[in-house]
């Protein structure tokens, strides 16, 4: 029997290196069967995930997946960090893996850590 659970397809340990000043769309791929669930984005702050209430979002449909998109127009230096999308479905809360944005501020040319650095500093990924 085909699964009709809601699925959020953000890849585990996914990351995106982006430039401050550029536009960027962060995708939360959502699979559902009947009624589209209520989906939100939050930004991780320590162990809590702070809901992003007043940010521009939109839906995009393709094939059997919908994409709940968080818009950065433009990306700001303080957009650096880890994000998660969540879906409310039949009174259940389903949370995605976190996805990390590494924002390079063109002015300061600060670079995101290398994968080797991240391996030795796992709190960058698991916050």
């Amino acid at each position: 029997k085909e699964s009709c659970d809601v699925q959020l397809y953000i890849k585990r340990q996914s990351e995106h290196s982006i430039l401050a000043g550029d536009p960027f769309e962060l995708e939360c791929p959502v699979k559902y069967c009947a009624n589209r669930p209520h989906v939100t984005w939050c930004k991780l702050n320590g162990t809590t995930c702070v809901k992003l209430e007043d940010r521009q979002t939109s839906w995009k449909e393709e094939k059997n997946i919908s994409f709940f998109i968080l818009h950065f127009e433009p990306v700001l230096p303080n957009d650096n960090g880890s994000y998660r999308c969540s879906a409310n479905f039949q009174s259940n809360l389903i949370e995605s893996h976190s996805t990390t944005l590494y924002v390079t501020d063109v002015k300061s040319a600060s670079e995101r850590p290398s994968k080797d650095e991240m391996a030795s500093r796992p709190w960058l990924l698991y916050r």
């Epitope: 699964s3 397809y9 995106h16």
Partner: antibody
Framework: QVQLQESGPGLVKPSETLSLTCTVS????????WSWIRQPPGKGLEWIGY???????NYNPSLKSRVTISADTSKNQFSLKLSSVTAADTAVYYC??????????WGQGTTVTVSS | AIQLTQSPSSLSASVGDRVTITCRAS??????LAWYQQKPGKAPKLLIY???SLESGVPSRFSGSGSGTDFTLTISSLQPEDFATYYC????????FGGGTKVEIK
């Protein structure tokens, strides 16, 4: 309808760099993830790596030191470079769209032989 | 990386037979598993995703089940065009494929 087409030399000398390009039509590489997979003659499938819609990459740990995947959004192409090749890298190389839950669109594959 | 072990590596069957292929993951992957069909000289074709969801355009005789570490692909009534090699695939951080199961004509 999204279609993928691999291109590149079919013969590469040992110790040289294998370079392949995947051209995407009917869709944009600015969404989704885009993978390279290979299949040695008579063997199974091996994932090489992917590039995301933002340009971030993830590689098979066993190949990581030799692999680079990049994208050219203006041409709607993504590319594979595999350095220091040996006969063990002889395979059919496929590009595919990683539609989050699996690879739903594949190129037809291109055969690369490593031989002097 | 997570390893996938498929069994059997090959099987012989007749048209109309019910065929079952299993895939075992070296650690739990929830339902993050897909199944592909590959015919000689062709690219793989996605059949099943999320362990049990049928990809668009795939005949309903194909079905998938399982969660965690043990998964099954079933062909309810084998058709002539189903003779091929089948692969399972987990799409965790480092994706991997099973070794394949070749379905041959008895």
């Amino acid at each position: 309808q999204v279609q993928l087409q691999e291109s590149g030399p079919g013969l590469v000398k040992p110790s040289e760099t294998l370079s392949l390009t995947c051209t995407v039509s009917g869709g944009s590489i600015s969404s989704y993830y885009w993978s390279w997979i290979r299949q040695p003659p008579g063997k199974g499938l091996e994932w090489i790596g992917y590039i995301s819609y933002s340009g971030s990459t993830n590689y098979n740990p066993s190949l990581k030191s030799r692999v680079t995947i990049s994208a050219d959004t203006s041409k709607n192409q993504f590319s594979l470079k595999l350095s220091s090749v040996t006969a063990a890298d002889t395979a059919v190389y496929y590009c595919a769209r990683d539609f989050y839950y699996g690879m739903d669109v594949w190129g037809q594959g291109t055969t690369v032989t490593v031989s002097s | 990386a997570i390893q996938l072990t498929q069994s059997p590596s090959s099987l012989s069957a007749s048209v109309g037979d019910r065929v079952t292929i299993t895939c075992r993951a070296s650690q739990g992957i929830s339902s993050a598993l897909a199944w592909y069909q590959q015919k000689p000289g062709k690219a793989p074709k996605l059949l099943i995703y999320d362990a049990s969801s049928l990809e668009s355009g795939v005949p309903s005789r194909f079905s998938g089940s399982g969660s965690g570490t043990d998964f099954t692909l079933t062909i309810s009534s084998l058709q002539p065009e189903d003779f091929a090699t089948y692969y399972c695939h987990q799409f965790d951080y480092y994706p991997t494929f099973g070794g394949g199961t070749k379905v041959e004509i008895k």
